[in-house]
């Protein structure tokens, strides 16, 4: 009975552009102007999203697409099909409840958007910091203490162990 | 249909003062946090102040005592009051609503106004 009531349905057949008008008699009338209708058999076209303030207009809206939106420069897009516009910040800085903010000590962020991350703790991998941490940088991690113990160099490996009682070659 | 109608812009001297009205239809004016932006030729956007719904406000760094966001919920009308004006405050001027209450940010569901032109001149 769906089938056959679909295939009588004189809106199936109303292509992407136009809706069904039922004021009409049913016929397929063209979407209105900024108005736009995907798919077929649609009983009404869907307005058209406008990219106003921030907002501009990366594709325009046309009978059968809806309009697409980017951010003006100084903000980045959030959210799917960019549904909202968020300033950006500097490097060494995020966006918090009163503006822009520099990372507070031992945090950093090297984007102009996100959040202040904390400095990796090199000492959680036994290892060293071999370049301080910014605001904008995290810390380089180096060898761990004990590679750098007097004599041993980071660079070469340390020879191999021999087993006791053997004597050098 | 909403709408946002700003209204007050226009020349003045430097260290002189204006005030911008931004008149709300459409809508329920009084749950709703409000925003001034404002645009320099040439450059981005940049926000200048907020108002909650409640009457809290937030100011830019570099408006900050001196410049005033009020509003009048009987009226559906936000107001900037801009003293002390410096060539660097001249701008076209956006009344906003303020949906995400994230300052430096709007969703795509907020409304704008067209904009006033504030000028300053020497």
């Known amino acids: 009975f769906e089938r056959t009531r679909s295939l009588q349905d004189p809106c199936s057949n109303c292509p992407a552009g136009t809706f069904c008008d039922n004021n009409r008699n049913q016929i397929c009338s063209p979407c209105p102007p900024n108005s736009f209708s995907s798919a077929g058999g649609q009983r009404t076209c869907d307005i058209c999203r406008q990219c106003k303030g921030v907002f501009r207009t990366r594709k325009e809206c046309s009978s059968t697409s809806n309009a697409e939106c980017d951010c003006t420069p100084g903000f980045h897009c959030l959210g799917a099909g960019c549904s909202m516009c968020e300033q950006d910040c500097k490097q060494g800085q995020e966006l918090t409840k009163k503006g822009c903010k520099d990372c507070c000590f031992g945090t950093f962020n090297d984007q102009k958007r996100g959040i202040c991350r904390p400095w990796t703790n090199c000492s959680l991998d036994g290892k060293s910091v071999l370049v301080n941490g910014t605001k904008e940088r995290d810390v380089v991690c180096g060898p761990s203490p004990a590679d750098l113990s007097p004599g041993a160099s980071s660079v070469t490996p340390p020879a191999p162990a021999r087993e006791p009682g053997h004597s050098p070659q | 249909a909403v709408q946002l109608v700003e209204s007050g812009g226009g020349l003045v001297q430097r260290g002189g003062s204006l005030k911008l009205s931004c008149v709300g239809s459409g809508f329920d004016f009084s749950d709703h946090a409000m925003s001034w932006a404002r645009q320099v030729p040439g450059k981005g956007f940049e926000w200048v102040a907020y108002i909650y719904s409640d009457g809290s406000t937030y100011y830019a760094d570099s408006v900050k005592g001196r410049f005033t966001i009020s509003r009048d919920n009987a009226k559906d009308t936000v107001y900037l009051h801009m003293n002390s004006l410096k060539f660097e405050d001249m701008a076209v001027y956006y009344c906003?609503?303020?949906?995400?209450?994230?300052?430096?940010?709007?969703?795509?569901?907020?409304?704008w106004g067209q904009g006033t032109q504030v000028t300053v001149s020497s």
């Open positions: 906003a609503t303020w949906r995400s209450q994230q300052v430096g940010r709007w969703d795509e569901y907020d409304h």
